[in-house]
Interface confidence: low
């Protein structure tokens, strides 16, 4: 199936040019998306090209500027947030990145009624997190690991917590491991729907071992960065959840929400909090051995001023074949009765599907079914449920949006997106206004991305929000590679692959092959999305064939494939890449003497193991910021898939699955190892240990470090990295510079 044919005709060949590395590094062919910032059923905010904040009313067709670019510029604001009563806007400036999601910033409050900044009781700086209440204009913020509350922006703050301490106690914000591996947010506080209560998490990292690394900077002596970071088997953070009445915050103070007994009996995690009503909250907990999750619905007892979580409102989700959930345990979407909910979990056939839970999980009603997976529930209204899945035409790497009518019986299903722009758009997400009156569809490909606005009742397209016309015009004279998405059937396993082929691809010729791998549990690389990136350039200009393969352990094709890697990381992911390469060779157009593999992070681990597999298939390969031993990586992630590194659990496979154990096998390949020295996520330690093992084995290899760079290797390092990797591959494939 050719998804993106190149537009090359003989008459045009002279005017067409190949992609250059410079195109990629300059972001020449990047695309735009349009996500409305919904503020009601029919209104949204959007930052215009000239940086005005504009309010759009879909029904009247009117728009007006609520905040001028002049006001934004006066405090160098890079972000904004309108209070729900529309009286105030916070302006965010001095953005300073911390980890993946977290950052600190300076906040100014602008009063829209008088056109002035609020003076008096200004916010401290820098703030770690700030948000409006869902109704009115209360403010909650986190400063120096403590939570503060303001009833109005000009009021003095009320301090909710007092025990916050850097690297020790975190209130309202996650510590490193919860941010990266559990919550995937910069915040750990949640307003109730009408702003009566504020729930928050407290993380105690007092007993967690610390990772320390040098940050070289410009000073005479390097700084040492210390992060409480639990590696596999280490002591974990202790979490507690509290709720405070924001109307009378001082009276009772924060009330702790009890942990379900079956969870509290051993090490556990808090995984998410969902408000149902102002006086009902749903908490999800997870055992440290992550195959048991408990969803607990708690009610406010006004007479006691406490939160009551009856056992009858505990719902257990357990996996007998792997871990609970996909990458994370799914979160519930509550229906209008405020007790029943919709949730995605595995059905009896081992496919993730939407279920409706009214009383017990055992009595759950299955809403979707089939040999495909429901991926996300976007919105539940009185009469409709909107979700995404990869059902259409049995392509796991697609995403379409569906509507199920839940107001009628039997429920009827309609694919909203399947036939809208079928060639251009096969991978969608959506953003809904209040009550799903309207929604935006964002199509990511395989064609050029496009964002559109739709009527939530009829699904009619109202207007195009962003169609990337400039990008379309810029690509008219570019020889883009061809892309195919197909599958291999091997020993009852389906291996989907994406192949990126040079523009003048000729099946009778031989081409060098580069495998790009990620391969981590519950990931997906073979997706029907648009991209003009480094591998596009390698195909377009350098004439390489690039392939991406989703093997065992990858997502959205059922539990059999997903949980195949449970407790055995580093085995089947590698085997399946190798199997795919052998199949590609059989296709006849691959030069067997010029095959390489590269990957980043988990992909660096898989590429390293593939190079050291002893198959003789790979001439060379690159590992960027690889994991080298699961004992070096974060507890929450690692133990989910590997269990504990203890003798009575899974220590043996922890030891057997290291890159270092295969040092000897790198002797017959060209290996390029790359890592940032300030990687807070996959620590430089991983590559340091690979390098040490290779030196000890007297195996030659190439390496590059990036001083003071983290896991993303951003900025100028990106340019250097891709230039360096390009030279390495061209040398490996004997391609002239």
């Amino acid at each position: 199936i050719v998804l993106r044919p190149s537009r090359v005709h003989n008459s045009e060949e002279n005017t067409m040019r190949a992609l250059t590395l410079k195109d990629i590094l300059n972001g020449t062919f990047s695309y735009k998306t349009f996500f409305p910032n919904w503020i009601s059923g029919q209104e949204y905010l959007h930052q215009s090209a000239d940086n005005n904040i504009v309010l759009y009313n879909i029904e009247t067709g009117q728009s007006y500027t609520i905040l001028s670019n002049r006001t934004m510029k006066s405090v160098n604001a890079s972000n904004y947030g309108l209070s729900p009563d529309r009286q105030f806007v916070y302006l965010e400036s001095d953005y300073s990145k911390l980890w993946r999601y977290s950052y600190t910033a300076t906040y100014y409050i602008y009063d829209l009624s008088n056109g002035e900044f609020v003076r008096g009781n200004e916010l401290p700086r820098p703030i770690q997190y700030l948000c409006w209440s869902p109704v009115g204009s209360k403010l909650a913020y986190v400063y120096q690991n403590n939570i503060y509350l303001k009833q109005r922006p000009g009021d003095p703050p009320f301090q909710i917590t007092f025990n916050g301490r850097e690297n020790k106690i975190f209130n309202g914000i996650p510590d490193w491991v919860y941010e990266e591996e559990m919550l995937a947010t910069k915040y750990a506080l949640w307003w109730s729907p009408n702003g009566k209560f504020l729930a928050y998490a407290e993380f105690n990292d007092t007993d967690i071992p610390v990772i320390a690394y040098s940050y070289y900077g410009d000073e005479q002596y390097p700084r040492t960065i210390n992060i409480p970071y639990p590696k596999a088997g280490a002591k974990n953070p202790v979490v507690r959840i509290f709720i405070i009445d924001t109307t009378y915050p001082a009276y009772v103070g924060p009330q702790e929400v009890p942990v379900p007994a079956m969870i509290a009996s051993s090490d556990y995690y808090f995984s998410w909090l969902t408000w149902v009503t102002d006086e009902r909250v749903c908490l999800q907990w997870l055992k440290r051995v992550q195959n048991v999750s408990v969803l607990s619905i708690c009610d406010f007892r006004e007479d006691w001023q406490t939160w009551d979580c009856p056992k009858t409102q505990e719902h257990i989700e357990e996996s007998r074949t792997g871990w609970a959930g996909g990458f994370f345990v799914s979160t519930p979407v509550f229906s209008y009765d405020a007790i029943s909910y919709y949730k995605i979990f595995s059905d009896k056939d081992g496919y993730k599907h939407i279920h409706y839970i009214k009383d017990t999980v055992e009595n759950a009603i299955q809403i979707t079914s089939g040999k495909w997976e429901a991926i996300n529930i976007f919105r539940v209204t009185q009469d409709s449920l909107f979700y995404s899945s990869n059902e259409f035409e049995e392509y796991p790497g697609r995403r379409n949006i569906y509507r199920i009518s839940i107001g009628s019986y039997p429920p009827s299903k309609k694919c909203v997106t399947c036939h809208l722009r079928k060639e251009r758009c096969q991978y969608y997400t959506a953003s809904f206004s209040d009550y799903a009156k309207y929604y935006a569809l964002v199509c990511y490909g395989p064609g050029i991305p496009i964002s559109t606005l739709h009527d939530g009742r009829t699904d009619q397209e109202i207007k195009i929000l962003e169609e990337n016309k400039e990008l379309e015009n810029a690509l008219k004279n570019i020889q883009l590679p061809k892309e195919e998405i197909k599958k291999l059937e091997v020993d009852e396993i389906t291996l989907w692959y994406k192949m990126i082929l040079p523009p003048q691809f000729d099946r009778s010729k031989k081409y060098p092959l580069l495998i790009q791998v990620y391969g981590g549990p519950c990931s997906q690389s073979v997706r029907s999305v648009f991209a003009v990136n480094w591998i596009s350039y390698l195909a377009s200009k350098e004439g390489m064939v690039i392939a991406l393969v989703d093997g065992r352990g990858t997502a959205f094709q059922g539990d059999k494939l997903l949980y195949a890697v449970y407790r055995k990381l580093g085995v089947y992911e590698v085997e399946d890449q190798i199997t795919a390469v052998r199949k590609f060779i059989e296709m006849g157009f691959i030069d067997e003497k010029r095959i390489a593999i590269w990957g980043w992070s988990y992909g660096g681990y898989v590429s390293s193991l593939a190079l050291a597999s002893g198959t003789g298939l790979f001439k060379c390969g690159i590992a960027v910021a690889p994991v080298s031993s699961w004992e070096y990586y974060a507890s929450v992630y690692t133990e989910r898939f590997m269990g504990l590194p203890t003798k009575d659990d899974n220590l043996e496979h922890y030891k057997n699955s290291t890159v270092m154990a295969r040092a000897e096998y790198f002797r017959n390949v060209d290996y390029l190892l790359i890592h940032g020295t300030a990687d807070d996520n996959v620590h430089f330690q991983n590559s340091a240990q690979i390098a040490k093992a290779l030196v000890n084995a007297q195996v030659d290899f190439q390496a590059m470090w990036y001083s003071d760079q983290n896991h993303g290797l951003s900025g100028l390092s990106t340019n250097h990295l891709y230039t360096h990797m390009t030279h390495f591959l061209k040398q490996c494939f004997s391609l002239s510079d």
């Epitope: 109307t247 009378y248 009276y251 009772v252 007479d303 006691w304 406490t306």
Partner: nanobody, 115 residues
Amino acid sequence: QVQLQESGGGLVRVGGSLRLSCAVSGSFDSRNSMGWYRQAPGKRREWVATITSGSRTNYADSVKARFTISRDNAKNTVYLQMDSLKPEDTAVYYCNAAPPIFNSWGQGTQVTVSS
């Protein structure tokens, strides 16, 4: 219906001490958080201190480190130990749940601090 009866007030010199009691009767559940409140002449009633069923305590900034709230669940009684009294502590003191969800307030007990 819950009945509240405050006692223990009186006239005291600056720096002196008093111990207030609040007897709770009727359909009272000891899991309620209880609080002390006060109202000075010509002013609005303000919150003073809270004690939860688990005996966690909270105090208004103006009384921190001088007043101590306690409770005896067996006797359904809440106490307020007032030390280092100041003239600005002069008020009628009341008890109620915290927040004050009981509709019927007691008569209160007068505390007067003279210099």
